[in-house]
Each structure stands twice: as C-alpha cells, then as structure tokens.
C-alpha cells in the first residue's frame, strides 16, 4: 500500500522537511503533490512524468519544492503556512491510480532565551530570588538547569508562570551556581546563556586554631603562639583580633612570641562580613604558666553571634 | 613602627625589564599582603596585583598578567615586584602598599615609591 | 572589572567651607570604600575603610557616607593641610580599582 512518511514530522521554521513515498506500484508513469488531503487542480504543486522526467509547476508551486524521480517531494525554507497534509496522486498505466496522504508539521523558530533575575546576589536565609526566562512563546515547554543539571527537588524552588519563573525561596550558601533556561518545542530547543548566582552568606561563627611552635600540649612560658582563626563567609570576612578587650590587629593569624604569664587573658576573633550584615565572633581564655603543669587553651569556648 | 622601604629610581630601555625590592619592617612580615601600586606622571593610582608572603600566592592585574612577576624572601622580610617588556607608558612612580588586614581591606601603609623610567 | 568615578574632578573651596567628593562605582560595593588622601610629592594616605570607619589619626572632620554604589567623603570644615588629592578605592576583592582622582585646592 502506498505511503507517505514526513523526515522529519516536526519541522522548524526555515528548515527543509522531505516527504517520501513508500510502496510505489510497479507500472507508474507520473506523479502529481498537492496540498492537502484530496486531489484537487487547484491545490497541484507539481506534476512529473517519468518518462520524460519532467516536473511541471502547479498553482499552489511556491518556488520551494523539488520533486524526485522516486516521487519524493522537498519542500525548503518551511513556513508555518506549510503545516498540513500532503497528497501524492501516482498515475499508472493502467489508469487506475493512487493516492497517499502525509502530513508535517512546522514550528516557530525559537529565539536564544536569556534570563532575568530580581536579585544576583541574595543573602542566605533572608532574600529569595526570582529569575525569568525571557521571551515568552506560546506552545513551548521551558525547562531550567543548575550546574548543568536538570533542577534539584525542594520545596524551596518553585517553577510558576508556565515554568517562565523559577523562584528561590529563602536562598542557601549551596544553591549558588550557574543557572540556564533551555526553550523547547517538538522541533527544536535553544538554552541561554549562563547567569551566575553568588549567594552571600556569613560570616559562620568562626573557629580558632591553635599552632604552638615548638609544638606542645601545653602554653609554656617563652613559646610563640599562633592563633589561626577561621570563618565561612562570602565575601570572605574582615578579621580582627581583641586580647583582653583590646583591639589588636586585622589579620588572620595573631602571632606573639615567647609568651609569658603576661599573656594570659581572652583572645577575641571577630569577623565582619558588610555585604550580609552579619558579625560573629569567638573568645578563648589562654593561660600561660613559667612550669609544665599549664592547663593550655582553655576548651569551652565562648560564641558571641551578632546580626 | 611599619616601614616599607623601596629601591632606588630606574631609568630603562623600552623593551627592557625593572625589578623593584619592598623591604618590609616594624611587623610580622608573613601576616599582611603586599600590594604593588603605580602612578604614572600627573595620573592617577592603579593597582598591579598583590602577593601573601606567607605562601607566595599572587593575584594580578589582567592588564599586567603574562608582563609582571611578584615574589618574596621570607628571610629578609622582602617582597619584589618585576615589570617586564617595558613600554614608554610604564613610566610611573611603583608603590608596595601593605593591606590593612586579611581579606577585603585597603591598603594602610605605602612604600616610599619608585622611580622607573622608561625611555630611548 | 568594577569602575571607580569620582567627582568633581578638581574643587576650590575656602578655609572653613564643607567640602564634598563623591564616588560611584559600577557594582554594589556593600560598603567596602575607602578614601586616600595624597598631597603634593607625597605617597597616598589611607583616611577611612569599610565606607566610614576613620583611620586612628585621621581628624575628625573628614567622615565617610554612602552605601550599594554611591559614596561621600566629607570634609566638614577644610583647612589649609588639607590641600591634596582624594582617591576612592573599593576593597572588596581584587582587582582592586580607584577613582580618577578629586584634587582639592584652597580659594
């Protein structure tokens, strides 16, 4: 039985869609296309007679169409206009002929997307960020991807708009990353590029390490300490250091040489992070004694947390 | 107190390459980052990169990356800013500035600055 | 990379007047601003960071105010020493960019 299949079925506008014929009877000696589901001469795009492998152009010819010697019909530079049936009429010897319809179906070129977004920089636990893939087309399914994966389950994304907005609620320090829409229809897909979210967050209560040179578990008279503190922060935070409610200096490490029971008292890191608005700090009581028997860094830390 | 204090002026060759010397004191030389900051004639500052003592890592300008070079000598408490295939528009006054703090600070003490002069 | 612009690019003022500089930067800074001050032959002196923090040193008729991406240095009452270059920079992160400059001269 003849056929018609349509390569491909789904065409993008401007693309080339090929209409083949499958089960062409043995005696044939021409063959007419024509728009839509019947014979009719108002709808002739082209007629070809095998014999002299000639085509003739019909009233409904555009310009676009080519017709093959297997009775295969191309049709180039697709417009939605060609959405529809396909008739072919093979004529036979015998004057008995067929007809097979196909049909396509074109879709609008998509545009590149991009994405517009309220807020690139969010502050952790407090902003939520909305981004919007932008244009809007009618018939296409929109999809997103973080890191280049297809988007994580959580209650705090939520997909509106006909998944146009993707918001996230009450952003965390983990959801900062590469975000892309990507636009399909049954034709074709097109992703945006790249937008960037830099969530900051911070500054974590910090931590302070102690490094004894020469290393010992104990604070002895006539060692340098050296107090690293730490804090998770983004923006990395602003260091400073108070001994004994005394400001000192604005670095990471506090370093004292050949400390002596002078020296004794609380160690205050603060951090500072002005983009968050956050502060956080830690206090260790540090003794020194002149003996071994030295009790060291005192472990119960206090944590003081402003916002 | 802190002092930072620089080579000498230098009168080069375009084409040529200058190697300035910050000589750090009066702190812990392996706790603040050095800066390498340039003002050309009757301009403005403009910032070349910075190096941690502490580990050698360095961060630079995107307009001087593949022509400049920083490092240090732990030992003399020195850091070294090196300007390579000068041009006549790197003539300027070279300053080492140390960074307040660590992290996010501005620059709080400056070098006495460098002459370099490029010139055929 | 963040754009510094300062203005006005140069002022003359008399002794006791309020002076004004402003800088805009291109990017929100969060408030990681600082002011220098560089008088004739001299190098740059740091005067205030983190927008308005003061500089142990630094008297106090010079003030800081701003915030996101606009900035102001004040001097409230200009006196003679005060005759220099005032630079904005942005501390937040490398590279570390400054404004072109506002020179400052007495009437």
């Known amino acids: 039985k003849l056929t018609i299949e349509s390569t491909p079925f789904n065409v993008a506008e401007g693309k080339e869609v090929l209409l083949l014929a499958h089960n062409l009877p043995q005696n044939r000696i021409g063959y007419s296309w024509y728009k839509g589901e019947r014979v009719d001469g108002n709808s002739l795009i082209v007629g070809y007679v095998i014999g002299t492998q000639q085509a003739t152009p019909g009233p409904a010819y555009s310009g676009r169409e080519t017709i093959y010697p297997n009775a295969s019909l191309l049709i180039q530079n697709v417009t939605q206009n060609d959405t529809g049936f396909y008739t072919l009429q093979v004529i036979k010897s015998d004057l008995v002929n067929e007809e097979a319809t196909g049909q396509f179906h074109v879709y609008p070129e998509l545009p590149k997307p991009s994405i517009s977004s309220n807020n690139s920089n969010p502050v952790e636990d407090k902003d939520a960020v909305a981004f919007t893939c932008e244009p809007e087309v009618q018939n296409t399914t929109y999809l997103w991807w973080v890191n280049g994966q297809s988007l994580p389950v959580s209650p705090r994304l939520q997909l509106s708009n006909g998944n146009m907005t993707l918001t996230l609620l009450s952003v965390k320090r983990n959801d900062a990353g590469s975000y892309e829409c990507e636009i399909q229809n049954p034709a074709s897909a097109n992703r945006s590029d790249p937008v960037t979210l830099n969530v900051l967050y911070g500054p974590d209560v910090p931590t302070i390490s102690p490094i004894i040179s020469p290393p010992d578990s104990s604070y002895l008279s006539g060692a340098n300490l050296n107090l690293s503190c730490h804090s998770a922060s983004n923006p990395s935070p602003q260091y400073s250091w108070r001994i004994n409610g005394i400001p000192q200096q604005h670095t990471q490490v506090l370093f004292i040489a050949k400390i002596t029971p002078n020296n004794n008292g609380t160690y205050a890191c603060f951090v500072s992070n002005l983009a968050t608005g956050r502060n956080n700090s830690i206090v260790k009581s540090i003794t020194v004694s002149a003996s071994g028997t030295s009790p060291g860094l005192s472990a119960g830390a206090h944590h003081h947390h402003h916002h | 107190q802190v002092q930072l204090v620089q080579s000498g002026a230098e009168v080069k060759k375009p084409g040529a390459s200058v190697k300035v010397s910050c000589k750090a004191s009066g702190y812990i030389f392996t706790s603040y980052w050095l800066h390498w900051v340039r003002q050309a004639p009757g301009q403005g500052l403009e910032w070349i990169g910075y190096i941690n003592p502490q580990t050698g890592y360095t961060s630079y300008a995107q307009k001087f990356q593949g022509r400049v070079t920083m490092t240090r000598d732990t030992s003399t408490s020195t850091v070294y800013m090196e300007l390579s295939s000068l041009r006549s528009e790197d003539t300027a006054v070279y300053y080492c500035?140390?960074?307040?703090?660590?992290?996010?600070?501005?620059?709080?003490?400056w070098g006495q600055g460098t002459l370099v002069t490029v010139s055929s | 990379d963040i754009q510094m612009t300062q203005s006005p690019s140069s002022l003359s003022a008399s002794v006791g007047d309020r002076v004004t500089i402003t800088c805009r930067a291109s990017e929100n800074q969060y408030g990681y601003l600082a002011w220098y001050q560089q008088k004739p032959g001299k190098v740059p002196k740091l005067l205030i960071y983190n927008t308005k923090n003061l500089v142990e040193g630094v008297p106090s008729r010079f003030s800081g105010s701003g915030s996101g991406t606009d900035f102001t240095l004040t001097i409230s009452s200009l006196q003679p020493e005060d005759v220099a270059t005032y630079y904005c920079q942005h501390h937040l992160g490398t590279p570390y960019t400054f404004g072109q400059g506002t020179k400052v001269e007495i009437k």
């Open positions: 500035a140390r960074e307040y703090g660590n992290y996010n600070y501005p620059l709080d003490y």
